[in-house]
């Protein structure tokens, strides 16, 4: 059962796993949620009745019964992890803590104009977990405006003390605000021989990479496959670091794979959710329960629904045995990974899907698309919305994309002459415009946020956000698309599609069925040659065939240019402008979304 509220002056007795330091009870709850075993916690706030050495302690706890006896204690705040909850979870913590010094290894000291600049520096430094900034009121003159970047083994402070005129905070890497590169390549037949901070067992290099991504100290990894010559090291995942942040030593070695933490791209690819099944593979660990199940999928469901289950092994039924049901072994370990992985015993293994809610919803796989044809099918572009105006009569105005449960990203030029958000309606999960009737449910628009540098589509900044009056419940037919990662600026997208209900030729009408067209991206240099009278800036991106024939057109504006990369769809562009439609040597011009990620996050994450 999901309990979100905090229990004041209450302490949970027993069940201790470990103690960490956090600046608030709220953050203690987040740390507990991300810990592989923590189900409950007790935080000690600062209080005259408490020993100062116990202030800010966050004791992570576990219990077989999922609860523990409660004891009254002043200054203690207790609560439950969000593991038991179904809502989306984020580790993003933008809070700034005044008069608190968060202790760690101070590895970098520099002057900064403000705490915000210090936090940005921390966010863009590969090693930084948190920072402390001495304000200009700090008593010691030589320490004023000093920004200390810090890291620890756990990613949380080793101690927190009160200190006047300083502020502390965390890196915003988990808020998708880092400019660090996102290197997704996995290098075959390569060992990184740098320092190991931990080792775990993993079924493949992808899981190893995801484990590295959410391990606070891991910057890159090496994985020994099941064909690795040394049996005792098969399926071993080595989590690594180095002073420079990059591997200093790459050695060619067959049956090993290496790669990098995906910390800088974690909002646009799954890093917690290990959804694959591993056939003829047994995961060893502490047994939680053995249950009868019809299939390995059913076994995974059982594991996902058992809050303490981390992974499972399913042994299929022997013929005509136990009504065709196999055995489902629900398991756990201290770090969330199997203690050993065995092959050739006939088991089917996998992980709980409970952690999937820690990933961005936009990374969820959607159903396979229909190749060929121009009409879309239901659920093919679940982020696409149709934006209607009701004035003077109701009609389709523009496209848009769901990027969050209360947010639509679209083009600024759609709102020319729109005086009030009250006349707007957002319809999601729509394939045919004819589905929209008087009684069709829609989302009202609470606010239109247009980029303040927008003047006209051709001069750029053609981007706007719609804040919805109510939240979108994600389903197969309405779900968000990922924003591109700032670290992905150099990615060459090859699978890009433009969608919309717009005209199919210059003089036409709005289409009934959502149309789709696969369109290649064009370099900005090439695009500039085609539009000599305009300035094609880096904040624009172009797409189109040299010979024309496929393009966005009137009515598609504001809709997505969606590109698939590493099995995840990204909102690379927003349909903005072009000369005519599908004309030869006149590519469509789109708002280059990656250049506006900071703006989007600033507006959507504002408190």
């Amino acid at each position: 059962e999901c309990v979100t509220q905090l229990l004041k002056d209450t302490c949970f007795e027993g069940g201790d796993i470990t103690t960490v330091f956090t600046p608030s009870a709220k953050y203690c709850q987040v740390v507990c949620t991300y810990h592989p075993r923590c189900l409950l916690f007790t935080f000690t706030a600062e209080s005259p009745s408490e020993d100062p050495t116990r202030w800010f302690t966050c004791v992570l706890k576990d219990s077989v019964t999922e609860t523990l006896p409660r004891v009254n204690r002043t200054a203690a705040i207790s609560g439950y992890s969000f593991k038991q909850c179904s809502h989306q979870i984020s580790a993003c913590n933008k809070d700034i803590y005044v008069d608190l010094d968060m202790k760690g290894i101070n590895y970098n000291s520099s002057v900064a104009k403000s705490a915000q600049e210090c936090q940005e520096r921390c966010t863009d430094d590969v090693h930084c977990h948190f920072f402390t900034y001495a304000t200009r009121q700090f008593p010691s003159l030589e320490h004023r405006n000093i920004c200390l970047l810090k890291h620890t083994q756990t990613g949380t402070p080793t101690r927190i003390t009160k200190l006047d005129k300083v502020v502390s905070g965390f890196s915003l890497k988990s808020c998708a605000l880092s400019n660090l590169a996102c290197i997704r390549d996995i290098f075959p037949n390569t060992v990184f021989a740098d320092s190991n901070i931990d080792s775990v067992m993993a079924p493949d290099a992808f899981v190893c990479g995801r484990i590295c991504t959410h391990h606070p100290g891991c910057l890159f990894f090496t994985f020994f496959s099941q064909e690795w010559p040394k049996e005792s090291q098969r399926n071993l995942c080595l989590l690594k670091t180095s002073e420079s942040g990059l591997p200093s030593t790459r050695i060619k070695k067959s049956k090993a794979l290496s790669g990098f933490s995906l910390q800088s791209c974690r909002h646009s690819i799954p890093v917690f959710c290990h959804s694959s099944f591993y056939h003829d593979t047994d995961f060893l660990g502490e047994e939680l329960d053995i249950v009868a199940a019809k299939s390995h999928e059913a076994c995974q469901k059982l594991c996902t629904n058992a809050v303490r289950c981390q992974f499972f092994t399913y042994t299929p039924a022997q013929a005509s045995c136990n009504e065709g049901k196999g055995k489902c072994y629900l398991k756990l370990s201290s770090n969330g990974s199997p203690t050993k992985i065995l092959h050739g015993r006939g088991g089917i293994s996998g992980y709980t899907l409970r952690l999937c809610k820690m990933d961005n919803e936009c990374t969820t796989k959607i159903k396979p698309r229909i190749v060929g044809g121009t009409a879309s099918v239901r659920g093919e572009w679940p982020w696409q919305v149709t934006l209607h105006t009701t004035s003077p009569t109701q009609r389709h105005l523009c496209g848009g994309s769901i990027i969050g449960n209360q947010w639509i990203l679209t083009a600024a030029h759609c709102f020319y002459g729109v005086e009030s958000p009250k006349i707007l309606r957002v319809y999601s999960g729509i394939l045919n415009q004819s589905e929209i009737k008087e009684d069709t449910s829609f989302f009202g628009v609470q606010e239109i946020i247009i980029h303040d540098q927008y003047k006209m589509a051709e001069s750029g900044y053609d981007i706007a956000l719609l804040k919805l009056e109510t939240t979108v419940n994600y389903t197969d037919s309405q779900r968000p698309i990922c924003l591109p990662s700032k670290g992905d600026r150099n990615v060459i997208y090859t699978d890009c599609w433009v969608t919309g209900w717009g005209y199919r030729k210059l003089r036409d009408k709005i289409q009934n069925t959502l149309q789709k067209a696969k369109i290649p991206l064009v370099t900005n240099e090439e695009c500039q040659k085609r539009y000599r009278g305009h300035k094609i800036t880096h904040k624009m991106i172009c797409a189109g065939y040299r010979e024309g024939g496929k393009d966005a057109c009137k009515g598609d504006s504001g809709g997505p240019l969606s590109c698939k990369h590493n099995e995840v769809w990204h909102l690379v562009g927003i349909t903005s402008w072009g000369e005519g439609c599908a004309q030869r040597e006149r590519p469509g011009v789109y708002t280059n979304v990656v250049e506006y990620v900071d703006w989007i996050l600033e507006k959507t994450q504002a408190v």
Partner: nanobody
Framework: QVQLVESGGGLVQPGGSLRLSCTAS????????MAWYRQAPGNECELVST???????YYADSVKGRFTISQDNSKNTMYLQMNSLRAEDTAVYYC????????????????????WGQGTLVTVSS
């Protein structure tokens, strides 16, 4: 019980040479990746050289052209021939088997199936 024993360390003048040996017991070199690591006082453990089971060799940039790694499988022994020694080569040298990287900067075992010797001190000083 796997044991790796280093020998050959000592005091040598700058420009001099030393040959380190590492002998293994309860363990065969044939299918193992062997390496020499070193740790100078106050520094992290660093990889000096590796010889892989398929005969490939690797050298850290700082020792390239001066150090040579080799092994004699019949004697279950690995060697590090160190020439043109410099003051900055002063460190404790460790022999390691199937050990790809140190444990958080220290020359100690960090994961299953990896082994370390006790180390031998090399001092380069005039």
């Amino acid at each position: 019980q796997v044991q790796l024993v280093e020998s050959g360390g000592g005091l040598v003048q700058p420009g001099g040479s030393l040959r380190l040996s590492c002998t293994a017991s309860e363990f065969t070199f044939d299918d193992s990746d062997m390496a020499w690591y070193r740790q100078a006082p106050g520094n992290e453990c660093e990889l000096v050289s590796t010889i892989t089971s398929d005969g490939g060799t690797y050298y850290a940039d700082s020792v390239k052209g001066r150090f040579t790694i080799s092994q004699d499988n019949s004697k279950n022994t690995m060697y590090l021939q160190m020439n043109s020694l410099r003051a900055e080569d002063t460190a404790v040298y460790y022999c390691a088997a199937d050990q790809w990287g140190s444990a958080e900067g220290d020359c100690t075992s960090s994961y299953p199936g990896g082994y370390w010797g006790q180390g031998t001190l090399v001092t380069v000083s005039s």
